[in-house]
C-alpha cells in the first residue's frame, strides 16, 4: 500500500506535512513522526529551546537561544536578582533586597558600620571607637584633642 | 481521562463584559493549544481564536480583535475567554476546546445571554 | 480568510442510505480539514481529522477523503443515531473557519 503524500503508517492513517509557524516548527521522518527544526521542542515542537544555561525558574524564551527574563532578574542566564534601587553595599537573594555587606548597615547598606577601618580618621595615635552607623569617636593621646585628634 | 469543565450559564446586559473560564484535566495542560468556538441559537459554529498555553500567546479571529481577550492560568489549568462590549448578538454558548489536528476534546459549553 | 462552502444544508435520508457531504474551500489547505457531527444541545463530537483519518471510536461506516480544495464526508450505510448536523473546519491557517453546516434528517 502506498499512502498519499504527508500520510504515513499501516493503513496511512499517521498524518504530518512539516511546518514553520505559529502551530509547530517540525520535519517529518520516513514513519510520519514531527522531528522538531534546531531549537524547538515538544509534542507539537512549538517551544523554543532558550539559551544553555538560562534560569528554567527566573528565564524564558519564545524564540530559540533567547532568554528572557522575569520581572527582578537580570544577566545572561536570568539568574541574578536585581537588588533594591540604590543599593550601595548589599546584595540580594531574591529580587528587590538589600542586604548588607560585612560593615555596612541601613536600608540602602550606605551607613559605614566600621566608620574607623574604613576611614582611620584618629590622628596622631588617638584611638578610634565605631559608635554607630557613620559614627565614630576618638579618644586621644595626651597632649592632643580635637574630633580627630588634630589639635 | 481528558476533561475540559467550563463555567455555568450567565446573563449579563448589552454593554457589559463576561469572562467564562475552562477548566482542564486529564492531560498536562501546556502540551495542547486551547481555542474558542461559539455557536449561536440555530446557527453554526464560528471559530473565535486560539492560545497557546504554554506561552500564553493568543490569535483571534479578526471579528472579534479588540473585544476578545484569551488567557491562561497554568497553576490552576484553566483557560479564559473574556468578550467585552456584548451586544445581543453576542447570545450564544461558548465552547473551549483542545487541539492541533481537529479538536477531540471540548468543553460542555456556557450559555451566555445578553439582554437588556 | 480561507472560505468554507458545505453542501448541501439540507438533506434528507432513510436508514441504510448512502450519503455524501462536501466542502470545498477557497484555496489549497493541503489535508487540513475536520469533519465533526454534533446533535442538538451537545458539543460537537470529532469524526475524520487531516481529511481522512477516522476518529477514534468512530464508526467505519464514516470516511473521509480529498486534499487540496475539494473534500467529502461519506457515511456508508446511515444508522438512525447519524441523523444530525455536519460540519467541516479547516485547520491550515488562522482563523480556522467551519462550514455552514450539512442539516441530515430523517426522509
Known amino acids: 500500500v502506498t499512502c498519499d503524500d504527508y500520510y504515513y503508517g499501516f493503513g496511512c492513517n499517521k498524518f504530518c506535512r512539516p511546518r514553520d509557524d505559529f502551530f509547530g516548527h517540525y520535519a517529518c521522518d520516513q514513519n510520519g513522526n514531527k522531528t522538531c527544526m534546531e531549537g524547538w521542542m515538544g509534542p507539537e515542537c512549538n517551544r523554543a529551546i532558550c539559551r544553555q544555561g538560562c534560569s528554567p525558574k527566573h528565564g524564558s524564551c519564545k524564540l530559540p537561544g533567547d532568554c528572557r527574563c522575569q520581572y527582578g532578574w537580570q544577566g545572561l542566564y536570568c539568574d541574578k536578582c536585581i537588588p533594591h534601587p540604590g543599593c550601595v553595599h548589599g546584595i540580594c537573594n531574591e529580587p528587590w533586597q538589600c542586604l548588607c555587606e560585612t560593615n555596612w548597615g541601613g536600608q540602602l547598606c550606605d551607613k559605614d558600620l566600621n566608620y574607623c577601618g574604613t576611614h582611620q580618621p584618629c590622628l596622631n595615635g588617638g584611638t578610634c571607637s565605631n559608635t554607630g552607623p557613620d559614627k565614630y569617636q576618638c579618644s586621644c593621646p595626651e597632649g592632643y584633642s580635637g574630633p580627630n585628634c588634630e589639635i | 481521562q481528558v476533561q475540559l469543565v467550563q463555567s455555568g450559564a450567565e446573563l449579563k446586559k448589552p454593554g457589559a463584559s463576561v469572562k467564562v473560564s475552562c477548566k482542564v484535566s486529564g492531560y498536562a495542560f501546556t502540551d495542547y493549544a486551547i481555542h474558542w468556538v461559539r455557536q449561536a441559537p440555530g446557527q453554526g459554529l464560528e471559530w473565535m481564536g486560539i492560545i497557546n498555553t504554554y506561552y500564553g500567546d493568543s490569535k483571534y479571529a479578526q471579528k472579534f480583535q479588540g473585544r476578545v481577550t484569551m488567557t491562561v492560568d497554568t497553576s490552576t489549568s484553566t483557560a479564559y475567554m473574556e468578550l467585552s462590549s456584548l451586544r445581543s448578538e453576542d447570545t450564544a454558548v461558548y465552547y473551549c476546546?483542545?487541539?492541533?489536528?481537529?479538536?477531540?476534546?471540548w468543553g460542555q459549553g456556557t450559555l451566555v445571554t445578553v439582554s437588556s | 480568510d480561507i472560505q468554507m462552502t458545505q453542501s448541501p444544508s439540507s438533506l434528507s435520508a432513510s436508514v441504510g442510505d448512502r450519503v455524501t457531504i462536501t466542502c470545498r474551500t477557497s484555496?489549497?489547505?493541503?489535508?487540513?480539514l475536520t469533519w465533526y457531527q454534533q446533535k442538538p444541545g451537545k458539543a460537537p463530537k470529532l469524526l475524520v481529522y487531516n481529511a481522512k483519518i477516522l476518529a477514534a471510536g468512530v464508526p467505519s461506516r464514516f470516511s473521509g477523503s480529498g486534499s487540496g480544495t475539494d473534500f467529502t464526508l461519506t457515511i456508508s450505510s446511515l444508522q438512525p443515531e447519524d441523523f444530525a448536523t455536519y460540519y467541516c473546519?479547516?485547520?491550515?491557517?488562522?482563523?480556522?473557519?467551519f462550514g455552514g453546516g450539512t442539516k441530515l434528517e430523517i426522509k
Open positions: 476546546a483542545r487541539g492541533y489536528d481537529g479538536f477531540a476534546y
Open positions: 473546519q479547516h485547520h491550515y491557517d488562522i482563523p480556522w473557519t
Open positions: 484555496e489549497n489547505i493541503y489535508s487540513y
